[in-house]
């Protein structure tokens, strides 16, 4: 197995991953196997109604660039704190001995797995578009359930990250075969998203590819500037009783998605009004209604607020509302 | 593809109670209400209520309010509309759809449920 | 008074054109809502036909023709489905519906037919 292996995002889009050779492999390493999904945002994060009170808003960071070669041991997946900067104990000969065992170990159950969990595949000649693996069987192990990947759907249910269908782990993944390093820059990723990356150490490229167990690790891209910004303008109608229906567009591509909305609002010369739009009253009125305004002059701006904080503010949408008792209801506003 | 599939034609006797179906698929369930709409024979349209599977917050037309309970289970991306205790009048065909605040308004809708009330 | 009203019927010839009415009641504006226009055939649901709120901001629905399109009689406080070219197959149930005040209303429908 590929050991410590390290993945960071030192972009929107990309994401590095460096690993170390296995201490005890079986013959030469003579390649290595990458393979990445896109994880789904967790279901919770959709349904949940971040204006109420008490509620904390979500948080996701992206994974940190590399502090030094050395310095970060683990997987640092988005849940993770880094370590603080400690320096390890020397070691007893009892844990030498322990760590001789488990390599000696390693290696027999490694053996085991080669030869009855996994049964070799012949070798397919692969674009790197997807898994070229489909005589590859894996035995059932309990632990590899349904993955959900976003895909685009009707223009009716506009966000990618509205739809999401569950897919055979190993059916369509993109992939890339390493040779002669232990590092790989994953790009062509989406913003602001998690990512599960396998990745296999491999002692035979043809005819039959032997390839270790998988080690996994989980990565998230860093945000993109502006794609939490509202683009298109803000809107308004002005109902019967001054109720006024402001309106926007949902930013198209968030980073991961969007939690909520904020409108502020003001009457010329008082003070600045804040209202909070979950996404689900969103969904019922593409937007929000203001509603008991007093007669005057309105300015208001809106920003949306992803998993990874807080878009731009729109510029200032401005209306004026009358006093409704002096004017007849057909006239168009 | 993005579609809402109802549960079979029912044949009730009134005061019996009665649960029908709609489930969701090829989109993100939890995300958008969801609608009823009744149809009575040889009458027009009548909105019902909606439903948002995220939280359950339901929404009843004023006509409907407390005619009917509407529910959903969104671990297998089904709304229901139920009654306690059936009328005749509630024979009708009942629709569900998804429900867009603009752009879409109710779209798709499902094929149709038919409650048939009679003794 | 119903707050969207339809003309219950409404026959034309075919070739001909068709218009369709949904008037609001007195004391909503026609200008400030969506009108969404949907067809049903007997025996299926409603389909989608169009949206319309002012010639900038309209759409009509995947596979619908070109002959169908929408409009606003201020005026009158209407919302208008027009039909051009008439075909037997258009023959079928009208209705408008708006978004008021956080619920769906429909019109009563209009049975529209080809002769």
């Known amino acids: 197995v590929p050991l410590d292996p390290i993945s960071v995002s030192n972009s929107s889009s990309q994401i590095i991953l460096k690993w170390k050779p296995p201490s005890d492999p079986n013959g030469n390493i003579t390649h290595y196997l990458v393979f990445w999904e896109r994880q789904a945002e967790d279901s919770e994060l959709f349904e949940l109604d971040y204006c109420l009170k008490g509620l904390k808003l979500p948080s996701r960071t992206w994974s940190p660039p590399f502090e030094s070669e050395d310095s970060q041991k683990h997987n640092q997946s988005e849940y993770e704190d880094s370590a603080g900067e400690c320096c390890s104990c020397p070691k007893t000969d009892s844990q030498i001995l322990k760590e001789l065992e488990e390599s000696s170990f390693r290696k027999t159950f490694e053996d085991y797995l080669h030869n009855v969990v996994f049964v070799p595949r012949k070798t397919s000649s692969g674009t790197g578009a997807e898994d070229p693996r489909p005589s590859r069987k894996r035995r059932s192990l309990g632990d590899v359930g349904n993955v959900t990947v976003a895909v685009p759907t009707v223009a009716a249910f506009p966000n990618t990250s509205s739809t999401s269908v569950p897919t055979s782990p190993e059916e369509h993944r993109p992939f890339e075969k390493v040779v002669n390093k232990e590092s790989l820059v994953i790009s062509g990723l989406r913003h602001f998203t998690g990512y599960r990356i396998e990745l296999q150490a491999c002692n035979q490229d043809t005819p039959e590819e032997r390839c270790s167990v998988a080690a996994y690790v989980s990565a998230r891209t860093m945000p993109e500037a502006k794609a939490d910004d509202i683009v298109g303008p803000v809107t308004h109608e002005i109902f019967e009783n001054n109720v006024v229906h402001l309106m926007w567009q949902e930013p198209k591509e968030p980073n991961g998605l969007i939690v909520l909305y904020e409108v502020s609002y003001r009457r010329y010369g008082d003070e600045e009004l804040h209202l909070c739009v979950s996404r689900k009253h969103f969904a019922l009125e593409r937007g929000c209604r203001l509603r008991g305004l007093s007669p005057g002059n309105y300015s208001v701006r809106i920003r949306a607020t992803s998993l990874a904080g807080n878009g731009s503010w729109t510029e200032p949408t401005y209306f004026y509302v009358t006093d409704y008792l002096d004017v007849p209801s057909n006239i168009a506003k | 593809e993005v579609q809402l599939v109802q549960s079979g034609a029912e044949v009730k006797k009134p005061g019996e109670s009665l649960k029908i179906s709609c489930k969701g698929s090829?989109?993100?369930?939890?995300?958008?209400?969801i609608g009823w709409v009744r149809q009575m024979p040889g009458r027009g349209l009548e909105w019902m209520g909606i439903?948002?599977?995220?939280?359950?917050?339901?929404r009843y037309s004023p006509s409907f309010q407390g005619q009917v309970t509407i529910s959903v289970d969104k671990s297998i991306s089904t709304a229901y509309l139920q009654w306690s205790s059936l009328k005749a009048s509630d024979t009708a065909m009942y629709y569900c759809?998804?429900?867009?605040?603009?752009?879409?308004?109710?779209?798709?809708w499902g094929q149709g449920t038919l409650v048939t009330v009679s003794s | 008074q119903a707050m969207l009203t339809q003309p219950a019927s409404l026959s034309a010839s075919p070739g001909a054109s068709a218009s369709l009415t949904c008037t609001l009641r007195s004391g909503i504006n026609v200008v400030a809502y969506n009108i969404y226009w949907y067809r049903q055939k007997s025996g299926s649901p409603p389909q989608s036909v169009l949206r319309y709120k002012s010639d900038s901001d309209s759409e009509r629905d995947s596979g619908v023709p070109s002959r169908f399109s929408g409009s606003k009689d201020v005026s009158a406080n209407a919302g208008i489905l027009l039909i051009s070219g008439l075909q037997s197959e258009d023959e079928a149930d009208y209705y408008c519906l708006i978004w008021h005040n956080s619920a769906w209303v429909f019109g009563g429908g209009t049975q529209l037919t080809v002769l």
């Open positions: 439903i948002y599977p995220g939280d359950s917050d339901t």
């Open positions: 090829g989109y993100r369930f939890t995300s958008y209400w």
């Open positions: 759809a998804t429900h867009h605040a603009s752009g879409r308004g109710l779209d798709p």
